[in-house]
Interface confidence: low
Amino acid sequence: IVLRPSRVHNSEENTMRALTLKDILNGTFSYKTFFPNWISGQEYLHQSADNNIVLYNIETGQSYTILSNRTMKSVNASNYGLSPDRQFVYLESDYSKLWRYSYTATYYIYDLSNGEFVRGNELPRPIQYLCWSPVGSKLAYVYQNNIYLKQRPGDPPFQITFNGRENKIFNGIPDWVYEEEMLATKYALWWSPNGKFLAYAEFNDTDIPVIAYSYYGDEQYPRTINIPYPKAGAKNPVVRIFIIDTTYPAYVGPQEVPVPAMIASSDYYFSWLTWVTDERVCLQWLKRVQNVSVLSICDFREDWQTWDCPKTQEHIEESRTGWAGGFFVSTPVFSYDAISYYKIFSDKDGYKHIHYIKDTVENAIQITSGKWEAINIFRVTQDSLFYSSNEFEEYPGRRNIYRISIGSYPPSKKCVTCHLRKERCQYYTASFSDYAKYYALVCYGPGIPISTLHDGRTDQEIKILEENKELENALKNIQLPKEEIKKLEVDEITLWYKMILPPQFDRSKKYPLLIQVYGGPCSQSVRSVFAVNWISYLASKEGMVIALVDGRGTAFQGDKLLYAVYRKLGVYEVEDQITAVRKFIEMGFIDEKRIAIWGWSYGGYVSSLALASGTGLFKCGIAVAPVSSWEYYASVYTERFMGLPTKDDNLEHYKNSTVMARAEYFRNVDYLLIHGTADDNVHFQNSAQIAKALVNAQVDFQAMWYSDQNHGLSGLSTNHLYTHMTHFLKQCFSLSD
């Protein structure tokens, strides 16, 4: 149980106030984290509060400004990147968001040795992606879907690709579906460790169907946005991987990396690329039916200037109970012999654990084990492996950092974070310097977040990087809700839940209940993290109890729970929310006539289905940007969990799992449907179809659209959205305004 600091004395109580909606919308109680921008084993960069770029040397304790705020301001720079030889900095301005990760920008190169901007051979604008080589100051960038290379910032560019074309051929950057559902990056190019080679992906979207929607803007006629977007079962992008020698790029040109035969025999995806050495690269491929993944290690053949991927260096990962991997197939972390690697995948008991692969996957040595999951491998050095897991005290919603000494036999395991600030910090991530000489720990809660710097050898805390003192002081006179994390055992299923309780919670009283749900495959909502957000306000000021439940399909509790939803999305996720609500009612403090559910995206889908479950449990609910039919969503995501919408595969469940099919069941609930018209991700089409089905069934409902807003409903729309949802819930729960 995590109890937020409570105030005991009545005199103190009087000076304290509840959270307001304005607090939330203004971000009054937002926290800061500190992630060092490591540039060596003992040095990092950080942008100071006054916008100077400062280099810190941990060992000397010295810091100095490498780039002044004056220089930053001269080009309205919002971001920077130092070249590895420390001679140049790129300054990024005119940021223009595209999709989740992608954006375009204008780039200026500042010459630190001369103290001026590089002039001549300047970069074109806007650039889709730009990065330094890992050594020296070479630049690779993508402009108009083609890749260019500069040996030095002031040199003329060398054009690597020539076939790039908007919405057709993408070089070095992903198309929409690869960005959102496979790579989770804005880039699709990778420098080799010493900058000798540059690998890149080419995506051919020529045959992909296009989603088109109106962008209303301010003009007389709306613009039409066209995005090649493969929905479930549609034609997918065709991907090819090339590698070019950046020292002599014109010599042999880009060389294609062969696709493993067992992958190439049918539709497939490229999932990630990992450089091992300058002349060894590891590619991961995935069948379109995403239960077979192949990791292929390829070597540079100097004599032919080609890349060879021997079958003996192909490692197959297959799932017989679900899809391959968790949300994504994990990526390997190679050891210093440059052939063996560490990787997270399911063990024989169905828990994701770290394995060491030396020759074949079959002969993998399991490094971690237990009824918990290893979540991320941060760093492998010659003597240590750092990873995160949720092992400690058997709370799946925690994250602690562990070190395994791989240099000694038998390897010994140490929890680096478990006992550091036990009450305050139970959910960590980490950022390591080169050779793990130093690392930063970022604690996200459940207490106020804190970032600290540590010695990579001794794990000793060196200093606090950010402790959010201002936030701590600001919260001193705020009545925060209490939070508890517990579990329900139902029919051999463990349902972890987080309950957010009003500050003066009294078990003998009855409270309205709001379920906040996401519930997507491999997600986790019940986490030991700090947050002062909309639901905090609803508990603090409006006296609601809010609950989040991780049901079947959610992550980090083993494959049985995770893969339970395989090929049948929209069934167990909903059942488990309903089961939890019934258990909450049994606890005795829930007013069963005032229960609501809300969710966004996948959560909007689950909340809609829960409202239409016919249980009579829910008085009202909200769906923000919901999926309404899996036929409308992206192929890569949807087919991972649902297979194909074909008669001989899983069309029947595609049809059965729509929100529209349950339109009739919305008759006895109050339903608020919300969507942005420019949602590139979950298309407005989804809500349009729900609305149409409800109208056709003559079911009353409420709706709100946000013109020209995407899946995030940002800016002023956010304020409007939460104000609108608050009114809706207060009305539903008969709470006075």
Partner: antibody, heavy 120, light 108 residues
Framework: DVQLVESGGGVVRPGESLRLSCAAS????????MSWVRQTPGEGLEWVSF????????HYTDSVKGRFTISRDNSKNTLYLQMNSLRAEDTAVYYC?????????????WGLGTLVTVSS | EIVLTQSPATLNLSPGDRATLTCRAS??????LAWYQQTSGQAPRLLIY???SRATGIPDRFSGSGSGTEFTLTISSLEPEDFAVYVC??????????FGGGTKVEIK
């Protein structure tokens, strides 16, 4: 003041072994990578071996791979070069050198050198 | 490996003269090039790193320039103590770290 003092040189026969040491002072030894560089009489400089600050990473020039081993003891502020199966062409003055900054393997401080003579 | 070729092998000059020494790399080394001075029987002394950055305590008559494969060390006005061997070293692509063969600056 930074000081690097090599020792352990001498005259040996081909096939024999020798262990060079380099005692460091005047700087935080454990924070810097170190290298051995040799110079054949009347010839140029040749890099021999590199070791990272913590000793986890070592590199060698091809001609000494498998024969020489670089190591360090940070508690003693000392760098070592174990030379086995010595050959006549290994005859040189051996310098230990301190890297100026991590990632940049050039040397701001050098020892005075120790002479290794391999002769039958 | 990257081969560094220095020219000329010997440079005969008088005190006060300007000395221009060249170091050519067999392939690009970016700006990862250092220059050392070595007087007979002594250890090398770092003059320039990153092609053009003067090391601590080095007089400003020494300057380095160049990038990629062509580098120059310039001594604007030779002092008596400057007559020595000058060696370039690349640290761009290593191992191995490689040195040039050296240029000997002799008194004419």
């Amino acid at each position: 003041d930074v000081q690097l003092v090599e020792s352990g040189g001498g005259v040996v026969r081909p096939g024999e072994s020798l262990r060079l040491s380099c005692a460091a002072s005047g700087f935080t030894f454990s924070s810097y990578a170190m290298s051995w560089v040799r110079q054949t009489p009347g010839e140029g400089l040749e890099w021999v071996s590199f070791i990272s600050s913590g000793g986890a990473y070592t590199h060698y020039t091809d001609s000494v791979k498998g024969r020489f081993t670089i190591s360090r003891d940070n508690s003693k502020n000392t760098l070592y070069l174990q030379m086995n199966s010595l050959r006549a062409e290994d005859t040189a003055v051996y310098y230990c050198a301190k890297e100026k900054e991590i990632w940049n393997a050039f040397f701001d401080y050098w020892g005075l050198g120790t002479l290794v003579t391999v002769s039958s | 490996e990257i081969v560094l070729t220095q020219s000329p092998a010997t440079l005969n000059l008088s005190p006060g003269d300007r000395a221009t020494l060249t170091c050519r790399a067999s392939q690009t080394v970016g700006s990862k090039l250092a220059w050392y001075q070595q007087t007979s029987g002594q250890a090398p002394r770092l003059l320039i790193y990153d092609a053009s950055s003067r090391a601590t305590g080095i007089p400003d008559r020494f300057s380095g320039s160049g990038s990629g494969t062509e580098f120059t060390l310039t001594i604007s006005s030779l002092e008596p103590e400057d007559f020595a061997v000058y060696v370039c070293q690349q640290y761009y692509d290593w191992p191995p770290l490689t040195f040039g063969g050296g240029t000997k600056v002799e008194i004419k």
